[in-house]
Interface confidence: low
């Protein structure tokens, strides 16, 4: 893993002035152990929205790695195989909470982030705007 | 808002020995300020692949409030407005973190959770599993 | 365990009405199509109608117009509305409900539990 | 109509023997075809899902193969309880068509 240095500026993790500040365990418990592994592994592949997984890595953030989707085409796969420019592919958004340091590269305090990521995509029926 | 008693067995916030813990600032700071607010609120109804959002709701979660995708249809809306059941619709799912309150019930101390949660559906064409 | 029982049927004369009705049980059944099939005297089988889980309706050719698929989640029962029918309807009329297993992403809608079947015999 | 042939429509075999029936769709069905196995007097059985997927509890004597127009239900040792008749459907579009049977008789 990468190593942070220690910022000298970081709280102390014991300082009751520390804004609006809870303690977090971080052994995550996962509640996802019934659920199959390959629940949606070649959705991205297999849609009529098919997307590409790209990899945002940001090391002052936790998790460090999240994957963004990007929709490879603006239309959407017809019967024939061929991109059908009457539907639109759309990424589906998300907001999800992040940790970010803060300050910057300490190992102890963060503060929650919202983030917006696009999960996949999905196929929709354009809306045509009439102009005036 | 929800008063949650405090637990009598809370860990002290300030205990050294807390496992692997760190301080959060849960002053969320949103990276989204400048997403259309619109981005995709009338997809679930516009997709080929339409969705349900249901309020899943948890006092003892943060967020306490999450909205999950339900498929509307095992098939997806073809051309005619009518479901096609040769191909079908699949819900996209995301890990997320939350934090749980752990001990339950107690204000400032958690534990980081992963939880699956369906963001939306899309219209994938058909698998055949082979059955060992 | 899936249980499906028909009921309905006998006999009517040509251009007569009969309701079938199939009771369902096992199974959470406003999650699944279900079809109706039947099966000429000596014939093989024929494919009726299908209703989805959301209501949508299909119906072979020669039925369209004069038969209705129905369904009420709450009774866990299918029906078949049969108008004007014809001598060439006569047949055992099976309710046939798909398969409970859910592997991947498969069209679950060919069916795999079948009733007893109800007898309509259309003579004059 | 997508218009199933099954071939033949009967044949005469003994316990052991090795049984192929064809089910030929005059347009492809891709993988949207299912076998199944009647008695007289009783309803049909599921034998073969999506091509060559085994219901489950059926002997595995039973198998299905093929693709896209042309299919087929081996039985590779014929049993006593095997005698009945076979049918294949298809449910890759409405109207869902069956084959008009293969009828499996003791020589």
């Known amino acids: 893993g990468i190593t942070i240095p220690r910022n000298p500026g970081c709280p102390n993790s014991e300082d009751k002035n520390f804004p609006r500040t809870v303690m977090v365990n971080l052994n995550i418990h996962n509640r996802n152990t019934n659920t199959n592994p390959k629940r949606s592994s070649d959705y991205y592949n297999r849609s009529t929205s098919p997307w590409n997984l790209h990899r945002n890595e940001d090391p002052e953030r936790y998790p460090s790695v999240i994957w963004e989707a990007k929709c490879r085409h603006l239309g959407c796969i017809n019967a024939d195989g061929n991109v059908d420019y009457h539907m639109n592919s759309v990424p589906i958004q998300q907001e999800i909470l992040v940790l970010r340091r803060e300050p910057p590269h300490c190992p102890n305090s963060f503060r929650l982030e919202k983030i917006l990521v696009s999960v996949g995509c999905t196929c929709v029926t354009p809306i045509v705007h009439h102009v005036a | 808002g929800i008063t949650i008693p405090r637990n009598p067995g809370c860990p002290n916030s300030e205990d050294k020995n807390f496992p692997r813990t760190v301080m959060v600032n849960l002053n969320i700071h949103n990276r989204n300020t400048n997403t259309n607010p619109k981005r995709s609120s009338d997809y679930y109804n516009r997709s080929t692949s339409p969705w349900n959002l249901h309020r899943n709701e948890d006092p003892e979660r943060y967020p306490s409030v999450i909205w999950e995708a339900k498929c509307r249809h095992l098939g997806c809306i073809n051309a005619d407005g009518n479901v096609d059941y040769h191909m079908n619709s699949v819900p996209i799912q995301q890990e997320i973190l939350v934090l749980r309150r752990e001990p339950p019930h107690c204000p400032n101390s958690f534990r980081l959770e992963k939880i699956l949660v369906s963001v939306g559906c899309t219209c994938v064409t058909p698998i055949v599993h082979h059955v060992a | 365990e899936v249980q499906l029982v028909e009921s309905g049927g006998g006999l009517v004369q040509p251009g007569g009405s009969l309701r079938l009705s199939c009771a369902a049980s096992?199974?959470?059944?406003?999650?699944?199509?279900m079809a109706w099939v039947r099966q000429a005297p000596g014939k093989g089988l024929e494919w009726v109608a299908t209703?989805?889980?959301?209501?949508?309706?299909y119906y072979r050719d020669s039925v369209k117009g004069r038969f209705t698929i129905s369904r009420d989640n709450a009774k866990n029962s299918l029906y078949l509305q049969m108008n004007s029918l014809r001598a060439e309807d006569t047949a055992v009329y099976y309710c046939?409900?798909?398969?409970?297993?859910?592997?991947?992403?498969?069209?679950?809608?060919?069916?795999?539990?079948w009733g007893q079947g109800t007898l309509v015999t259309v003579s004059s | 109509a997508i218009q199933l042939t099954q071939s033949p429509s009967s044949l005469s075999a003994s316990v052991g023997d090795r049984v192929t029936i064809t089910c030929r769709a005059d347009?492809?069905?891709?993988?949207?075809m299912h076998w199944y196995q009647q008695k007289p007097g009783k309803a049909p059985k599921l034998l073969i899902y999506?091509?060559?997927n085994s219901e489950i509890g059926v002997p595995d004597r039973f198998s299905g193969s093929g693709s896209g127009t042309d299919f087929r239900l081996t039985i590779s040792s014929l049993q006593p309880e095997d005698f009945a008749t076979y049918y294949c459907?298809?449910?890759?579009?409405?109207?869902?068509?069956f084959g008009q049977g293969t009828k499996v008789e003791i020589k």
């Open positions: 046939a409900s798909p398969p409970q297993y859910y592997e991947g992403s498969i069209p679950r809608l060919w069916p795999a539990h």
């Open positions: 096992g199974f959470p059944f406003s999650d699944y199509s």
């Open positions: 209703i989805g889980p959301s209501g949508d309706t």
């Open positions: 347009e492809s069905v891709r993988t949207l």
């Open positions: 999506l091509v060559s």
């Open positions: 459907l298809q449910t890759h579009s409405y109207p869902y068509t």
